[in-house]
């Protein structure tokens, strides 16, 4: 085609195009102040405005902050690019129990199959380990390498209380046990594995920084660029990302060039009062008994674990809504129904059981 073999550097004398020797073709010259979206733009739509660092240009042409993967339980899956947010996922050995835009709000450890059970499906970043009864003749303790990892005394084998089949009654009770040490506690103190990918220090494919002399005449090396810690929102406005600096908050998704940072309550807490991209008030989360086991669920991003033991054992424990997701900090419909005084009593030893309503919200059960 003629465009593939232009006259030397002239592009047939068309001033709106230039010849790129690297790709050996004529490219559209973005107007001054705009930034090319590809190496050799072909049309005006291939030009954009420039956002601030850690911001991306969203579908509405607004600079929005990229999410960050700075939480210890997250790793960067894809970097912050000029037109897409950074994407985070749970680090190896953990799965996402509560998803979030471009990230995961809550990661939990993969379950360790207990004695008598073997791994049916290994855990992924999205799904928990699925266990099944061991076949006769197979050593129940070491039916698979993962089963040989025995949890330390006093801990629960699951990463979190696991979902149950939809309850037939409006509420099921669960005793609150004081001697239980939550795996969430341990998770919150863990540091990222040395060989795990990390967003720290790794430049994205396009952080929004331009070459030495941005926007020279005719180069079009520009796009709307918001300041760092700001994102280009849906209306095209540079908007400040929320801060997760409060002690009871952790970063759920980072500040990206086209999406705000989002915060959630730290492990062991649940959002009682939601706020945009954050939580205004976090309260302690109900604790489940160490012996609790549940039935498998065949849904993505759910805590799908092993089958329950025979009848007559501990009652099911399910502090999450029936869909299996933990309450999201930004969802006003999934807040605790206990008052602040009652919420303070939940994590400590008590004889008062906590009931779960049909919506999965914990309420005090007078007994």
């Amino acid at each position: 085609f003629p465009q593939d073999r232009p006259f030397e550097d002239t592009c047939h004398g068309n001033p709106s195009h230039y010849y790129d020797k690297a790709v050996r073709r004529c490219c559209y010259r973005c107007p001054m102040g705009l930034f090319p979206t590809q190496q050799c733009p072909q049309r005006p739509t291939d030009c954009r405005k420039q956002c601030e660092p850690d911001y991306y240009l969203d579908e509405a042409d607004r600079c929005t902050a990229c999410v960050t993967c700075s939480r210890d339980d997250l790793v960067e899956k894809t970097p912050c690019a000029w037109n897409s947010s950074r994407v985070c996922e749970c680090r190896p050995g953990m799965f996402c129990s509560t998803s979030a835009v471009n990230s995961c709000a809550r990661c939990f450890f993969h379950s360790v199959c207990p004695a008598g059970m073997i791994v049916k499906f290994p855990g992924t970043a999205q799904k928990n380990t699925v266990c099944e009864p061991a076949s006769p003749g197979v050593s129940p303790a070491c039916a698979s390498p993962e089963n040989c990892k025995e949890p330390s005394s006093g801990t629960i084998p699951q990463a979190k209380p696991t979902p149950v089949s939809p309850a037939t009654s409006s509420a099921s009770t669960m005793p609150v046990r004081g001697g239980t040490r939550l795996a969430q506690e341990a998770a919150s103190k863990l540091t990222r594995a040395p060989d795990s990918p990390s967003s720290v220090g790794r430049p994205s494919s396009d952080p929004g920084l331009s070459p030495t002399q941005p926007c020279p005449e005719g180069s079009g090396d520009c796009r709307k660029q918001c300041e760092p810690d700001y994102y280009l929102d849906e209306a095209g406005r540079c908007t400040a990302c929320v801060s997760c600096s409060r002690d009871d908050l952790v970063e759920k998704t980072p500040c990206a060039w086209n999406s705000s940072r989002t915060c959630e309550c730290r492990p062991g807490m649940i959002c009682a009062t939601s706020a945009t991209n954050s939580c205004a008030r976090c309260v302690p989360y109900p604790i489940c008994a160490a012996e609790t086991v549940t039935k498998p669920q065949d849904m993505a991003e759910k805590d799908t674990t092993f089958e329950a033991p025979p009848l007559g054992t501990q009652p099911d424990c399910n502090p999450t809504p029936e869909n299996g997701e933990a309450p999201a900090s930004t969802s006003p419909t999934q807040s605790l129904l206990v008052d602040s005084q009652a919420s303070k009593t939940l994590p400590i030893p008590t004889s008062a059981p906590v009931a779960l309503s049909s919506t999965g919200k914990p309420v005090l059960d007078a007994g």
Epitope: F35, S210, P211, K224, P228
Partner: antibody, heavy 119, light 111 residues
């Protein structure tokens, strides 16, 4: 040639407002953030905020939020900074400056507009 | 906001001497492998003039005797051999966080 030409000096009473203009030429006005910086007599520089003329997007220094309003007129390639509820400590030279896309530096500056607030 | 502290406040030197100006930030200015630190020169009655961007890149048209260095929180501007026209005020500026802030300035005066 890139040029930023600001309006002339102003003398204002406390409590009143002032609107300083900055006419740009020689570049694509809509595609560069326009910053506003002020400098009190014998003092340092203070960033007030910036506006993206292409769509009117703004960032403000919280210190001035509510008192400063940045606007831009694409048809005349002119940026405006209005400061209200003036007090004596607002006496300063006000600069407009174009922000480079990419490294956030301000490469071209207006000559400055002296605003004196006195009763 | 990020606080920038410049030192010394005044530097008294003679033409031909080497000048080293310091600027310390209250938190890191690192951003995707670059530091969002800028240096400006200002003479009486004039607007500031961009010298250095991204901590160490010299703006087009600025003499090679000007150089910038540093990363994280500690930065410096060096004038290898002072010329008479270099005696002026110098300001550092950060663009890492909004609001952008400037240092208090260093006055380079003739000794």
């Amino acid at each position: 040639e890139v040029q930023l030409v600001q309006s002339g000096a102003e003398v204002k009473k406390p409590g009143s407002s002032v609107k300083v203009s900055c006419k740009a030429s020689g570049y694509a006005f809509s595609s560069y953030w326009m910053n506003w910086v002020r400098q009190a007599p014998g003092q340092g520089l203070e960033w007030m905020g910036q506006i993206y003329p292409g769509d009117g997007d703004t960032n403000y220094n919280g210190k001035f939020q509510g008192r400063v309003t940045l606007t831009a007129d694409k048809s005349t390639s002119t940026a405006y900074m209005e400061l209200s509820s003036l007090r004596s400590e607002d006496t300063a030279v006000y600069f407009c400056a174009r922000r480079i896309n990419g490294n956030f530096a301000m490469d071209y500056w207006g000559q400055g507009t002296l605003v004196t607030v006195s009763s | 906001e990020i606080v920038l502290t410049q030192s010394p406040a005044t530097l008294s030197l003679s033409p031909g001497e080497r000048a080293t100006l310091s600027c310390r930030a209250s938190e890191s200015l690192e951003y995707y492998g670059t530091s969002l630190m800028l240096w400006y020169q200002q003479k009486p009655g004039q607007p500031p003039k961009l010298l250095i961007y991204s901590a160490s890149n010299v703006e087009s048209g600025i003499p090679a005797r000007f150089s910038g260095s540093g990363s994280g929180t500690d930065f410096s501007l060096t004038i290898s051999s002072l010329e008479p026209e270099d005696f002026a005020m110098y300001f550092c500026q950060q663009r890492r966080k909004v609001p952008s802030t400037f240092g208090g300035g260093t006055k380079v005066e003739i000794k």
